[in-house]
Amino acid sequence: DAEFRHDSGYEVHHQKLVFFAEDVGSNKGAIIGLMVGGVVIA
């Protein structure tokens, strides 16, 4: 039986990003997102 293993050869870094809601609308508070490989995904 063969074992398949994916190895991309590089590590994808992620970073928490925080924005103020008032910068993108009229609400108060902070919005937390996640940047993975240079793209904000959440």
Epitope: K16, V18, F19, E22
Partner: nanobody
Framework: EVKLEESGGGLVQAGGSLRLSCAVS????????MGWFRQAPGKEREFVGA????????YYADSVKGRFTISRDGAKNTVYLQMNSLKDEDTAVYYC?????????????????WGQGTQVTVSS
């Protein structure tokens, strides 16, 4: 050109308090998002906290949450960092920084205006 100037640093005993000020000149204060960073000897500059342009919202690093408070005074074009219950590990050079609206508040590269820094030393 926007200029930021910090003041209020100094030597304080552990458990004590200190208030840093950051005077902003040369720009429209209400359009600049303000933050505080710090850099301890031999370490990278780290995010401390930030305040929104209106002053209605603040956000803090976990390491200072509940002890530090950021406020801003639009009449004086000044941002404040009130530091209470100071610990040895709070010893660092503290920098105030300004960023354009819409940028992430917790990362260094969002900020394009920086003060010269003020030293805070906490002794036990």
């Amino acid at each position: 050109e926007v200029k930021l100037e910090e003041s209020g640093g100094g030597l304080v005993q552990a458990g004590g308090s200190l208030r840093l000020s950051c005077a902003v000149s040369g720009g429209t204060f209400s359009s600049i998002g303000m933050g505080w960073f710090r850099q301890a000897p031999g370490k990278e500059r780290e995010f401390v906290g930030a305040i929104s342009r209106s002053g209605d919202s603040t956000y803090y690093a976990d390491s200072v949450k509940g002890r530090f408070t950021i406020s801003r005074d639009g009449a004086k074009n000044t941002v404040y960092l009130q530091m209470n219950s100071l610990k040895d590990e709070d010893t660092a050079v503290y920098y105030c920084a300004g960023r354009p609206a819409g940028t992430a508040i917790n990362i260094r590269r969002s900020y394009n205006y920086w003060g010269q820094g003020t030293q805070v030393t906490v002794s036990s």
